[in-house]
Amino acid sequence: KSPIFGPQEVSSIEGDSVSITCYYPDTSVNRHTRKYWCRQGASGMCTTLISSNGYLSKEYSGRANLINFPENNTFVINIEQLTQDDTGSYKCGLGTSNRGLSFDVSLEVSQVPELPSDTHVYTKDIGRNVTIECPFKRENAPSKKSLCKKTNQSCELVIDSTEKVNPSYIGRAKLFMKGTDLTVFYVNISHLTHNDAGLYICQAGEGPSADKKNVDLQVLAPEPELLYKDLRSSVTFECDLGREVANEAKYLCRMNKETCDVIINTLGKRDPDFEGRILITPKDDNGRFSVLITGLRKEDAGHYQCGAHSSGLPQEGWPIQTWQLFVNEESTIPNRRSVVKGVTGGSVAIACPYNPKESSSLKYWCRWEGDGNGHCPVLVGTQAQVQEEYEGRLALFDQPGNGTYTVILNQLTTEDAGFYWCLTNGDSRWRTTIELQVAEATREPNLEVTPQNATAVLGETFTVSCHYPCKFYSQEKYWCKWSNKGCHILPSHDEGARQSSVSCDQSSQLVSMTLNPVSKEDEGWYWCGVKQGQTYGETTAIYIAVEERTRGSSHVNPTDANARAKVALEEEVVDSSISEKENKAIPNPGPFANEREIQNVGDQAQENRASGDAGSADGQSRSSSSKHHHHHH
């Protein structure tokens, strides 16, 4: 007996689709070996139609796929647009040849069954409405008109022209005529449910001269659309319910046994499991909306339904759309921590992954806000200036080519705690979600700047030093000048680098920056930070104010602006690896600078972590507190 298992018999009708699941034993070899679907011929040969190696036969082109779910030890063959030619014997199996482990599957595709010629078929989706057309002869114009639903023995009245209405159709059924046409009456039934499906008879007149018409009403539950997404990626449910529900509250829910638990609706309800990683976006006045979920988890797999009702909850007889979401654990999106921890006054460096094939894409960082329908306004981007309230404490460092860009936020306050998204204007799957937690600082900061009263005098020389602990000895130290387009790295001098590498004197580890001579343009925010290669660590910020010099001080000739930031001591002790590195200029707002557009961006997601040592502190919190408070509180 084969250890592979699946459905022995699959039956469907022309034009439909099938989704065949094959189960295999839980072994590492099985999870990684080739999976195939082949058709058995009369000779006993089995011809491959599709395989996990990427092979797709001509007859399946554009209508079939094979997806492996190693975490479930299953693979799924989806085949669409079935024809009777697809009827036959097949095998689903594992192995390098089609003689490996396999399971026999019989597929039968039938013609769509035909109804008697005098029956008019109406096919409608749940929640929609139907208008049944009932023709009659002119002589029956004055007679009673009616619609009844056939049961086993009789025909139960739905509605008639004397305004009699079956209790289960009150408020849903209307009998009417159009204009002056005395040869047709109509019955409209709204908010259709499964129970409305069946055979109906419309009638005008009584006895043998009565006009009768048979009607077959089919009420369909929407076929779930199959969505296959990678772990940590994102999914967008595009819901199009029609103009008739444009003004109703919208929802997305997830099937749970018999109920459908609301995940989010436009009335402000949101499942806590989706906090920080979900947005609902009304698209237009035609009842269209979308729900974006990022950071997909294994447990997000399941059956989803969107709908509309004034309550914001699922209601029978209202239009719905459904999806079956599969989450594949074989993901291209790197696994990172979803929570980053910082301390008040400190900093965090967040490594944001992006598709390495799209290094030139625009990078952004936004803060998820749960109020209303949820939105994510951009705070910084490669072509979006830093938002004003983040002046001096937020920068994006793009590292083209390595699949990561870094966002640094310093001078942390407890108000910074929350959810943030990394995103690009490229591959939408790579949107990542990160939760920032900020605790009260309980120790001295790792990086401290002196002097703390940072006021430089115009035309004079001004040096600031950044003290760092021995644990940062082997890391690169840098100073950069912050602007709302990034943080431009300056030449600096590392005093600690001159010491013997055997010992480390905690008191003398410092990296200094000198402004000589000081000019008015030197005023602003400066950061001192550490990094290891392309991995950024802690930073601290200081605001340097520039004042006119008092009378009697010596005059210094102004020098070229590019030479103002000078090395403190001998040229050869400067760490050349951090001199004159500049991140890209980002002059104008990008496509996601607008909150509305962030809500509408497509499909993707993922959890994230910070690089470097989270929980550093802001060494200039005392020296420039007035400036800090002015900007951030």
Epitope: Q8, E9, S12, I13, S17, I20, Y23, M255, K257
Partner: nanobody, 126 residues
Framework: QVQLVESGGGLVQAGDSLRLSCAAS????????MGWFRQAPGKEREFVTT??????????YYADSVKGRFTISRDNAKNTVYLQMNSLKPDDTAVYYC?????????????????WGQGTQVTVSS
């Protein structure tokens, strides 16, 4: 809730046939699959067959021990699933349980099913 009621069990000779029915009532539109399990005295409940559906497509799964002898079918209008058992053997003696599920990851696993009937006894004498 979904209620399941089995019928059609009884005592038959080896080689005979029997047809079991399972009628579902309640919120049946939420069900996605129905099937049969059996339990012989002193043994664990074992998978026999299941039918799942999506629109007009049906998928039928059988245990190796009943393949070719048992057939599962359903009447959508009556919310009923049938198990046609041919060429019965004494080994088929057991209590047969009908089960229904709203979501099925693996049809062979009893814990995947949300609703169960009370069971109907099938005895095959030699």
């Amino acid at each position: 809730q979904v209620q399941l009621v089995e019928s059609g069990g009884g005592l038959v000779q080896a080689g005979d046939s029997l047809r079991l029915s399972c009628a579902a009532s309640g919120r049946t539109r939420t069900t996605y699959g129905m099937g049969w399990f059996r339990q012989a005295p002193g043994k664990e409940r074992e998978f026999v067959t299941t039918i799942t559906w999506s629109g007009s497509t049906n998928y039928k799964y059988y245990a190796d021990s009943v393949k070719g002898r048992f057939t599962i079918s359903r009447d959508n209008a009556k919310n009923t699933v049938y198990l046609q058992m041919n060429s019965l053997k004494p080994d088929d003696t057991a209590v047969y349980y009908c089960a229904a599920s709203t979501v099925l990851t693996d049809p062979r696993v009893p814990t995947e099913y949300d609703y169960w009937g009370q069971g109907t006894q099938v005895t095959v004498s030699s």
